[in-house]
Amino acid sequence: IVLRPSRVHNSEENTMRALTLKDILNGTFSYKTFFPNWISGQEYLHQSADNNIVLYNIETGQSYTILSNRTMKSVNASNYGLSPDRQFVYLESDYSKLWRYSYTATYYIYDLSNGEFVRGNELPRPIQYLCWSPVGSKLAYVYQNNIYLKQRPGDPPFQITFNGRENKIFNGIPDWVYEEEMLATKYALWWSPNGKFLAYAEFNDTDIPVIAYSYYGDEQYPRTINIPYPKAGAKNPVVRIFIIDTTYPAYVGPQEVPVPAMIASSDYYFSWLTWVTDERVCLQWLKRVQNVSVLSICDFREDWQTWDCPKTQEHIEESRTGWAGGFFVSTPVFSYDAISYYKIFSDKDGYKHIHYIKDTVENAIQITSGKWEAINIFRVTQDSLFYSSNEFEEYPGRRNIYRISIGSYPPSKKCVTCHLRKERCQYYTASFSDYAKYYALVCYGPGIPISTLHDGRTDQEIKILEENKELENALKNIQLPKEEIKKLEVDEITLWYKMILPPQFDRSKKYPLLIQVYGGPCSQSVRSVFAVNWISYLASKEGMVIALVDGRGTAFQGDKLLYAVYRKLGVYEVEDQITAVRKFIEMGFIDEKRIAIWGWSYGGYVSSLALASGTGLFKCGIAVAPVSSWEYYASVYTERFMGLPTKDDNLEHYKNSTVMARAEYFRNVDYLLIHGTADDNVHFQNSAQIAKALVNAQVDFQAMWYSDQNHGLSGLSTNHLYTHMTHFLKQCFSLSD
């Protein structure tokens, strides 16, 4: 299926140009999306092009500036947040990135009613996290690992926790591993729906081993960065959940929420918290061996001022074929009765689907079914449930939004997006206003992305929010590559692939092939999305064919494919890339003497193992920030898929699946190894060990490090990286510079 027709007529050919590397590095062809910042059922905020914060009312069609760009500029604000009572706005400046989600910032409060900044009892700086209560204008914030509460922005703060200590005790914010591998947020505190209670997590990292690496900076001596980071099998953080009454915080103080007995009997994780009502909360827990998850619904006991989690309100989710959930265990979406909920988990056929749980998981009512997967529940209202899936036309790499009418019996299902802009839009997400009165659809491709506003009752399109006209015009004279998404059937395994072909692709000619791989558990690379990136350039200008293949271990095609890699990372992911390459060669247009593979992070691990597979298929390859041994990576992620690195568990495969063990096999390939020295995620240690093993085996290879760069290799390093990799590939493929 050709998703992007070349739009080239012969007469126009000479006015068209290929993509350049400069185009990619400059972000010339980047697109915009429009996510409304909903503040009610029919109103949203948006930052205009001139940086005013504008409030839009869909029903009246009116808009007005609630915060002037002059005010934003006066504190160099890069972000804002309106209090629910609309009286105050916090302005965020001095953004300083920490890890993937976390950052510190300076916060200023602007009083919209008085038209000036709040001066009394100013917030300390830098703050690690700050948020408004869901109602009114209470503030909760984390400063120096402790949580504070303000009843009003100008009031003095009330200190909730006192034991916070850098790298030791974290209150209201996650430690490194919880941030990256469990919560995927910068915060670990949650307001109850009306702001009566504030729940928070406390992480105790006292006994966690520390990863230490040098940060070279500009000083005479490098700094040492120390992060409590549990690698596979190491001691983990100890987590506790507390809830405090924010109306009378000093009255009884924080109350701990009990952990279910079956969880507390051995090492465990807290995975998420969902408020149901002001006096009912739902906590999810996970055993360290991550195939058992417990969802616990707890109620406030007014008489004792404590939280009670009866065993009858514990729901167990267990996997017998792999780990619990997909990448994470899914979170519940509660219905209006405040006890039953909707949740995505595997059905009896091994496909992730929406289930309705009223009393027990065993009696769950399956809401969706089929050989496809429900991916996200966006919103449940009195009469509708909105979700996304990859059901339509059996393409796993698509996302459409569906509505199930739960108010009628039998429930009827409608695809909201399937036929809206069928060629242009096959991969959607959505953002809903209160009560799903309105929603925005954001289409990511395969055509140029477009964001639209819709009526939540009729699904009628109200207006286009962003259609990327400028991008469309800019691309008119660009020779974009062609893209096709197809599948290979091999030994009862379906391998979906995306092939990116040069603009004047001719099946009778031979082209160099580059495999781009990620391949991590529960990932998906073959998606119907728009992108003009480095591989687009390689196809457009350098005439390469690029392929992405979703093999075993990847997501949204059922548990058989997903859990195939359980306890065996580094085997089937690599096999499936190799199998796909052989099939591509059979297609007749690949020059089998010029095949390369590259990947980043997990993809760097897979590309390294593929290069060292001894097949002779690959001439060269690149690994950027690869994992080299699962003993070096984070406990929460690694153990989910690999178990523990102990003799009586899975130590043998931990040892067998390292890149170092295959050092000898790199002798007949050109290998480029790249890593940032300040990588907090996949530590430089991984590449250092690969390099050491290659040196010890006397195998020649190329390497590049990026001083003081993390896992993202951002800024000027990005330009250097892609320029360097381009030269490497062109040399490998004997393409003139």
């Epitope: 009613s113 038209g115 009394g120």
Partner: antibody, heavy 124, light 113 residues
């Protein structure tokens, strides 16, 4: 010359409500917030509350919260202050005053122009 | 709330003489960010609304005679009339606009001796 012209004197019974208007002219209405201040006989000036004409968001002194409602009609460049559940101690002269909006972090302005005042008498 | 206390409650000064009024705030009205004191002085004559004389503790409003001056820092402030004129007979109020609620002093009545 900037003008803030208030409505005339009112005599009200206890428990009743009063609504005082403040019509402004000769300046850009949306560049200033409007505040209401009262002065009971022999008493100090007492701030009641204010409103931002750009967004219609009011801010009230906690002492009056629940009894006072401040609104604006931007098209008429007029602000209103309504006080309900009147009692004898609400007998006072009620003033409106303007205060420049502070866009910058270092700004902050005093009330530079005041209305002529409206005498509200609460008596049974 | 910030409480403003003026002294004296009343003051009788001969024409041409100096009049000094003090104002004390229960907490600082000095803003560390810009080193400005968020304090104003108003003059109110019988049957008239207050008139702004001084803002930021020491800046004269345009059109205000230079015999009026303000000084002070943090919590202690002074309004000085260097040479009292007959038209200066009025009640003078200090007001903080550092934080809400905005609060006024109880007023100082200035008369001619």
């Amino acid at each position: 010359q900037v003008q803030l012209v208030q409505s005339g004197a009112e005599v009200k019974k206890p428990g009743a409500s009063v609504k005082v208007s403040c019509k402004t002219s000769r300046y850009t209405f949306t560049e200033y917030t409007i505040h209401w201040v009262r002065q009971a006989p022999g008493q100090r000036l007492e701030w009641i509350g204010g409103i931002n004409p750009n967004n219609g968001i009011p801010n009230y002194n906690q002492k009056f919260k629940g009894r006072v409602t401040i609104t604006v009609d931007t098209s008429a460049s007029t602000a209103y202050m309504e006080l309900s559940s009147l009692r004898s101690e609400d007998t006072a002269v009620y003033y409106c005053a303007r205060r420049r909006i502070a866009y910058g972090y270092d700004e902050g302005h005093a009330m530079d122009y005041w209305g002529q005042g409206t005498l509200v008498t609460v008596s049974s | 709330d910030i409480v403003m206390t003026q002294s004296p409650d009343s003051l009788a000064v001969s024409l041409g003489e100096r009049a000094t009024i003090n104002c004390k705030s229960s907490q600082s009205v000095l803003y560390s960010r810009n080193q400005k004191n968020y304090l104003a002085w108003y003059q109110q004559k019988p049957g008239q609304p207050p008139k702004l004389l001084i803002f930021w503790a020491s800046t004269r409003e345009s059109g205000v005679p230079d015999r009026f001056s303000g000084s002070g820092f943090g919590t202690d402030f002074t309004l000085t009339i260097s040479s009292l004129q007959a038209e200066d007979v009025a009640v003078y109020y200090c007001q903080q606009y550092f934080s809400y609620p905005l609060t006024f002093g109880q007023g100082t009545k200035v008369e001619i001796k």
